[in-house]
């Protein structure tokens, strides 16, 4: 939870809690307003004092997941619980005690109170991670030329500062071609068009007067090796459709070099599916480059029995060709219940 000084409580979600399901004792000065947020969400959270749920109006109220005390009085001291509605699990367990003098900042304890210029009470706290789930990917192995973003979203009071280190040394990107992008409000470091010399350990150091935290990322830059297009396995997929329906065949293409894509339908000429050269007879249905909007989807509208057959996604670049095929089966309308889709396909590669 946090004790807030924001004037924007009704519009912004509560900051992330410092510690959940932990008992905490806070000392509040006589007459101070108190505003406590329960977790990251205002929904489904209720405040209780000494076992009784707080009303949503009045001098002391539980409202939208917040505990608000207009002006702290001796009788407001006591034990407060924030419970999740439904499960009734304890989200926060908090004891407020009164002190008739404002506390001084105790550097040993990140949970002491101070007074803001507006008179609202708020929590002095050491830095903490607000979105640790965004920091789970420690190793970033990326192809050369890509953009890399490291982030260490944090909070604290006073608001912490963030500094970045590369291999243990202060990092400002001055020696890096293209420099770096630091967004302090998003606690992020961005490097565009990475090169092998960007490899290393990147550490964010977040600190304020009450403490510091750090986290390290590992960056490996993979040098690109030229290759023919790679087609995602299983696509296009064998598909069964009903006469009159619409069909989409999907082909996912990965290629460093600019790929050229064709959708082909295998056809029969003079009773044969193959020419004298051993190559299949095909009809080109669609030709495109990968950066147009629908490059990898073949749309077949209002299919008929004649549309049944083998379809191939052919992708080529300066290195070579790759292709994968799938079969479309078209059923009469009365057999609609039998329609299904499977995801098997053949893959072939040629240089």
């Amino acid at each position: 939870f946090s004790l807030e000084a924001s004037e924007e409580m009704e519009q912004e979600p509560c900051p992330a809690p410092i510690s959940e399901q932990q008992e905490q004792v806070l000392t509040v000065a006589l007459g101070q307003p108190v505003r406590l947020c329960c977790g990251r969400t205002e929904r489904g959270r209720h405040w209780y004092k000494e076992g009784s749920r707080l009303a949503s109006a009045g001098r002391v109220r539980g409202w939208r997941g917040r505990l608000e005390i207009a002006s702290f009085l001796p009788e407001d001291a006591g034990r407060y619980l924030c419970l999740a509605r439904g499960s009734m699990t304890v989200v926060h367990n908090l004891t407020l005690i009164m002190d008739d003098s404002l506390p001084s900042i105790n550097n040993e304890d990140p949970k002491t109170l101070s007074s803001s210029s507006s008179g609202h009470s708020y929590l002095q706290q050491a830095p903490y991670w607000t979105h640790p789930q965004r920091m789970e990917k420690k190793l970033h192995a990326v192809p050369a030329g890509n953009t890399v973003k490291f982030r260490c979203p944090a909070a604290g009071n006073p608001m912490p500062t963030i500094h970045w280190l590369k291999n243990g040394q202060a990092f400002h990107g001055e020696n890096r071609i293209g420099g770096i992008r630091l967004r302090h409000q998003h606690w992020s470091l961005v490097m565009e068009s990475v090169v092998p010399s960007d490899r290393g350990t990147y550490t964010c150091l977040v600190e304020n007067s009450l403490g510091s935290i750090r986290y390290s990322y590992l960056l490996d830059v993979l040098e690109r090796s030229p290759h023919r297009p790679i087609l995602q396995a299983g696509l296009p997929a064998n598909t069964t459709a009903v006469v009159g329906s619409n069909v989409e065949l999907l082909c996912k293409v990965y290629s460093d070099a600019q790929p050229h894509i064709q959708w082909l339908k295998h056809i029969v000429i003079n009773g044969s599916s193959f020419g004298a050269d051993g190559f299949p007879y095909v009809q080109v249905l669609k030709t495109t480059d990968i950066n147009s909007s629908e490059v990898e989807v073949l749309y077949l509208r209002n299919v008929s029995a004649e549309d049944a057959g083998e379809y191939t996604c052919l992708a080529g670049n300066s290195i070579g060709l790759s292709y994968q095929s799938a079969w479309l089966t078209v059923l009469p309308a009365e057999e609609e219940d039998l329609a299904w889709t499977t995801a098997t396909s053949e893959a072939r590669y040629t240089d």
Partner: antibody
Framework: QVQLLESGGGLVQPGGSLRLSCAAS????????MSWVRQAPGKGLEWVSV????????HYADSVKGRFTISRDNSKNTLYLQMNSLRAEDTAVYYC????????????WGQGTLVTVSS | DIQMTQSPSSLSASVGDRVTITCRAS??????LNWYQQKPGKAPKLLIY???NLQSGVPSRFSGSGSGTDFTLTISSLQPEDFAVYYC?????????FGQGTKVEIK
Amino acid sequence: QVQLLESGGGLVQPGGSLRLSCAASGFTFSDYAMSWVRQAPGKGLEWVSVIEGDGSYTHYADSVKGRFTISRDNSKNTLYLQMNSLRAEDTAVYYCAREKTYSSAFDYWGQGTLVTVSS
Amino acid sequence: DIQMTQSPSSLSASVGDRVTITCRASQDISSDLNWYQQKPGKAPKLLIYDASNLQSGVPSRFSGSGSGTDFTLTISSLQPEDFAVYYCQQHYSPSHTFGQGTKVEIK
């Protein structure tokens, strides 16, 4: 409630200049990064520029780099976009948008102001 | 810059249909992807942020999924007010590029 109101659009000749403003209310302006996003008639959205809450960071789309300047006056709760060397392809509705905290999602948008570059 | 490719560019659907729109990034963008809805003459509206988080006030029939390069916006049961243009937007790189849009029309 949060409100963003753009102004300053209009008709300008190629090579001319224009300054757009975005008046913000209903939130602590200096706490939020702000962006400009534009939309040419009948086309999709194109991000133009961003500025941090304290003005310490700015960034621009390649298409406007060197011609447009984003700025803000937190004492007036106002965001600006100075547009110089305007081209026909800059013709668009320009929106100002607020970024969510900890993310770059635009959670509030203005109604837009139309900039027409034509001789 | 990171390129964002949406598909399809347009689709026709009926009220009650389940609709899926996909967005692909030209490189890994983690979960730094947002989805917007725009109706004619109006400003865009944020639906989903960071790939899968529903923006406050947005109906629960909208959902987002994906990470890395492939992302999906799903409308579980299309309502009359959902006919609009939908855009994805990446914010992994400093230039926050949008997809070209997907127009959802009435069948």
